[in-house]
């Protein structure tokens, strides 16, 4: 039901289910070396891992999706691991008039869930 | 860059990329037949399809994810198709004291993007 409880224990084994993971990336990796000046190395937290039935369900829709995927796996995809919240990131970058510091609110994941 | 433009034309062919699709589901399918009284048949809009590079990117994070997936496909998953917004749905359901109408805000997808 819509009252079903999302579960937090991973039935697939440690590190297999949806979680936050840090990925190192350079500005060159991101294609940003022409406009971002600092930081030159980014610690990018991303959401990775599988979403088994009802694991960290984002909401009622995700619970429905998990249920219908079990019934119609060819038609309804399993929920997938995406950010539930973000960490602000300060970038020093070029502007038309010089250099600017700007905070980006949607760049690095802080938490993950299955949607 | 964070200025990259998410694209809206599907390079994989019609209907293959992330989009909204209606799935018919009965209360039995959802395991809700013991508490939901109406509607007895639900038109569930869900997000399905693939997320090729920069297609309908949800935000800067999704653009980064797409880029890093191209560089490290084993380590960074591709963005996936999830709801960007929801349509409220009214359900008539049993309560301890009788029957109630309740609006659910997170049950049916209204739009999709790649996150």
């Amino acid at each position: 039901s819509a009252h079903a409880h999302p579960r937090d224990s991973c039935p697939l084994g440690p590190g297999r289910c949806c979680h936050l993971e840090t990925v190192q990336a350079t500005l060159e990796d991101l294609g940003w070396s022409d406009w971002v000046l600092s930081p030159r190395q980014l610690q990018l937290s991303m959401c990775v891992g599988e979403c088994p039935h009802l694991y960290r369900s984002a909401n009622t829709h995700a619970q429905i999706k998990a249920r219908l995927h079990g019934l119609q796996p060819d038609k309804v995809p399993a929920p997938c691991c995406v950010p539930s919240s973000y960490t602000p990131v300060v970038l020093m970058h070029r502007t038309d008039s010089g250099v600017s510091l700007q905070t980006y609110d949607d760049l690095v994941a802080r938490g993950c869930h299955c949607a | 860059s964070a200025h990259a433009h998410p694209r809206d034309s599907c390079p994989l062919g019609p209907g293959r990329c992330c989009h909204l699709e209606t799935v018919q589901a009965t209360l039995e399918d959802l395991g809700w037949s013991d508490w939901v009284l109406s509607p007895r048949q639900l038109q569930l809009s869900m997000c399905v399809g693939e997320c090729p590079h920069l297609y309908r990117s949800a935000n800067t994070h999704a653009q980064i994810k797409a880029r890093l997936h191209g560089l490290q496909p084993d380590k960074v998953p591709a963005p996936c198709c999830v709801p960007s917004s929801y349509t409220p749905v009214v359900l008539m359901h049993r309560t301890d004291s009788g029957v109630s109408l309740q609006t659910y805000d997170d049950l049916v997808a209204r739009g999709c993007h790649c996150a």
């Epitope: 840090t22 070396s33 022409d34 000046l37 600092s38 930081p39 030159r40 190395q41 980014l42 610690q43 937290s45 960490t87 602000p88 990131v89 300060v90 970038l91 020093m92 250099v99 510091l101 905070t103 760049l107 690095v108 802080r110 | -």
Partner: antibody, heavy 119, light 112 residues
């Protein structure tokens, strides 16, 4: 307006561990791109970068001190800390905490705290 | 480590007159992106250092426009167009191209 405040003992005995904490107010310590940094200044001398920590917990240390330094962060308290082990009189200095964009652009500093190493 | 050398060690100045401080690095601070990774700081007597200039020539927020940074590669200059009494203190350059960041020895600016 971001403010930083160092705290910790002003006197440490030789061979012991120097421990300092920097409390950040007026902003979250959990921001990407920001490196929370320790810098020291020996009496009447210039500045020396000790090391820094990113929001993710990644640390960067001056190779000249690396074997003795540990920097950690406590996001729940909006604090970061410095531990310097096996201190000698040469570690007597004013210790500053600062906010950097990566390891440059130190735009906010604590007022500094003098730590004397003496028996 | 990159070695930073400042000159002069001490600079007596007259209010209203210009002043210039030199900073030299043991290797080029010019990044492939075209920017020089060099900061300038001022430490006023009894205070913490404050950021004046970053990336060689960009004034930090709130810094008066009488301060300017120039130079490229290994040779850099901080100029004060018209010195004011409040500008006294020790000026430091710092390279930020490589870890560890390293500071120059400082230039003490005092009123004549």
């Amino acid at each position: 307006q971001v403010q930083l405040q160092e705290s910790g003992p002003g006197l440490v005995k030789p061979s012991q561990t120097l421990s300092l904490t920097c409390t950040v107010s007026g902003g979250s310590i959990s921001s990407g791109g920001i490196y929370w940094t320790w810098i020291r200044q020996h009496p009447g001398k210039g500045l020396e970068w000790i090391g820094a920590i990113a929001y993710s917990g990644s640390t960067y240390y001056n190779p000249s001190l690396k074997s003795r330094v540990t920097i950690s962060v406590d996001t729940s308290k909006n604090q970061f800390s410095l531990k310097l082990s096996s201190v000698t009189a040469a570690d007597t200095a004013v210790y500053y905490c600062a906010r950097g964009i990566e390891y440059q652009h130190f735009d906010y500093w604590g007022q500094g705290t003098l730590v004397t190493v003496s028996s | 480590d990159i070695v930073m050398t400042q000159s002069p060690l001490s600079l007596p100045v007259t209010p209203g007159e210009p002043a210039s401080i030199s900073c030299r690095s043991s290797q080029s601070l010019l990044h492939s992106n075209g920017y020089n990774y060099l900061d300038w700081y001022l430490q006023k007597p009894g205070q913490s250092p404050q950021l004046l200039i970053y990336l060689g020539s960009n004034r930090a927020s709130g810094v008066p426009d009488r301060f300017s940074g120039s130079g490229s590669g290994t040779d850099f200059t901080l100029k004060i167009s018209r010195v004011e009494a409040e500008d006294v203190g020790v000026y430091y350059c710092m390279q930020t191209l490589e870890l560890p960041p390293t500071f120059g020895g400082g230039t003490k600016v005092e009123i004549k």
